[in-house]
């Protein structure tokens, strides 16, 4: 069963800034990836950004870069500033497309004891909806 | 969360007409597109119409002047009209909501399908 983890952390230069890395684990070809935060895609969160593997990436404030690190991982740097900043409580989700196929995703947050700069290596997170 | 069900789909002659429904509930922010994307039987996937968040529709080559699409925002839904429906046009027809990248919708969530059979 294809899963998908998600990676919250903090930059120890800029405390309000946060990079977010998400991973598919499955064999199946990705056709769409979106990272949102407050909830999961279509259900209540905010799209930060979208990146198709070949026509391109749309992003919105706060996120300042995405990108794609694999052809099944991606990551997105935000910047905090103001209203729009996000705090260390903030869930992030990523859902992975596959159209017809079906999409996964999964949420992550900063953990609670983490300190700026530090993470652990990338964990496969629960999957909260396979369609 | 986003569920798209299409229905109208089924047998019909060649040169007949089908009309596609697809009813849309809850929503994904910043979504700016909604259409119909269609796979043949061992065939790739194909976009098929969109409607971009500007209202404008846009059509794949193949179906210009025979298919229109469109959508009642009041329903939530979202329309396939298909005139002078010819064999190649059967597929399993999907509705889509997704993000726009140029002139292509990229489908971010969908239906489960409904087949389209042209057939005499």
């Known amino acids: 069963t294809p899963e998908v983890w998600v990676q919250v952390r903090m930059e120890a230069t800029e405390l309000s800034s946060f990079t977010i890395r998400c991973g598919f684990l499955g064999s199946g070809s990705i056709s769409l990836v979106t990272v949102s935060w407050g909830g999961p895609n279509g259900a209540g969160g905010t799209t930060l950004a979208v990146l198709h593997p070949e026509r391109g990436i749309r992003q919105w404030a706060p996120a300042r870069q995405a990108r794609w690190e694999t052809q099944s991982s991606i990551s997105l740097i935000l910047e905090g500033s103001g209203a729009s900043s996000p705090c260390a409580n903030t869930t992030f989700c990523c859902k992975f497309a596959s159209f017809p196929e079906g999409s996964w995703e999964a949420c992550g947050s900063l953990p609670p004891s983490s300190d700026p700069g530090l993470s652990a290596p990338p964990t496969p997170a629960p999957i909260l909806r396979a369609d | 969360e986003v569920q798209l069900v299409e229905s109208g789909g089924g047998l019909v002659q060649p040169g007949g007409s089908l009309r596609l429904s697809c009813a849309a509930s809850?929503?994904?922010?910043?979504?700016?597109?909604m259409g119909w994307f269609r796979q043949a039987p061992g065939k790739g996937l194909e976009g098929v119409a969109h409607i971009d968040s500007d209202g404008i529709p846009r059509y794949v080559e193949s179906v210009k002047g025979r298919f229109t699409i469109s959508r009642d925002n009041a329903k939530n839904s979202l329309y396939l009209q298909m005139n002078s429906l010819r064999a190649e046009d059967t597929a399993v027809y999907y509705c889509?909501?997704?993000?726009?990248?140029?002139?292509?919708?990229?489908?971010?969530?969908w239906g489960q399908g409904t087949m389209v059979t042209v057939s005499s």
């Open positions: 889509v909501v997704g993000f726009k990248f140029g002139d292509y919708c990229a489908p971010n969530d």
């Open positions: 809850g929503f994904t922010s910043r979504t700016d597109c």
